[in-house]
Interface confidence: low
């Protein structure tokens, strides 16, 4: 029986050109997490495999950074990044858990005040 629950950062907004952190956490289960997939609609953004580590899809490697934790950092946001993002936890023996985040990227009205940040 699947007893786990996924907590996410929910519905979030960010400015065009900025960066955002997407985070999920799987709780209430003792199942082993074997892999976490991050997907945008039907596109695979990144994979974090328990044994092999992170893999960022080539088409996103310039704008997606792994972490913190099993989360994902999206950089240089465009309005086309608006939409649903999914964290998909592959676990044993439970199976698959999915969390949903909706990101809205807003046109920047004060882009000259923008502050970038980095994930060490």
């Amino acid at each position: 029986m699947m007893t786990g629950t996924i907590e996410t950062t929910g519905n979030i907004s960010a400015e065009k050109g900025g960066s955002i952190i997407l985070q999920c956490h799987l709780s209430s289960t003792t199942a082993q997490v074997t892999q976490v997939n991050w997907e945008q609609q039907d596109q695979l953004l990144a994979i974090c495999n328990a044994d092999l580590g992170w893999h960022i899809s080539p088409s996103f490697k310039d704008r997606v950074a792994p972490g913190p934790g099993l989360g994902l950092t999206l950089q240089s946001l465009t309005v086309n990044d608006t939409g649903e993002y999914f964290c998909i936890y592959h676990t044993y023996p439970d199976g698959t858990y999915t969390g949903r985040i909706f990101l809205e990227v807003l046109e920047s009205s004060v882009a000259e005040h923008g502050a970038r940040f980095q994930i060490p």
Partner: nanobody, 117 residues
């Protein structure tokens, strides 16, 4: 709009401790997370720690085991307990919340932490 007010910074000797607080008011939400970033002179703003409202936490490698982030949801406040401080922790510390928050410029005013003997 979310207003974020940080406090608790100051001058501390290496090995000492400080506790930062960040109070959020205005258009706050019950979901999402709150986090801390810092910016040292001449460097980029960098991630320090964050906490989901349910209590799960993340830390930058440079502060793991020394810093503890927590949140009091009833007060819309997050805290950063900083122990075993090092000179390289000297920076202006900023808090943020990701719900209704525009990452480009909606930061609090920051609180300065100086670690020096």
């Amino acid at each position: 709009e979310v207003q974020l007010v940080e406090s608790g910074g100051g001058l501390v000797q290496p090995g000492g401790s400080l506790r930062l607080s960040c109070a959020a008011s205005g258009n706050t939400f019950s979901g999402g997370f709150m986090g801390w970033f810092r910016q040292a002179p001449g460097k980029e703003r960098e991630y320090v720690a964050s906490v989901l409202r349910g209590g799960y936490t993340w830390y930058a490698d440079s502060v793991k085991g020394r810093f503890t982030i927590s949140a009091d949801n009833s007060k819309n406040t997050t805290y950063l307990q900083m122990n075993s401080l090092k000179p390289e922790d000297t920076a202006v510390y900023y808090c943020t919340t990701d719900r209704g928050y525009n990452w480009n410029y909606d930061w609090g005013q920051g609180t300065l932490v100086t670690v020096s003997s």
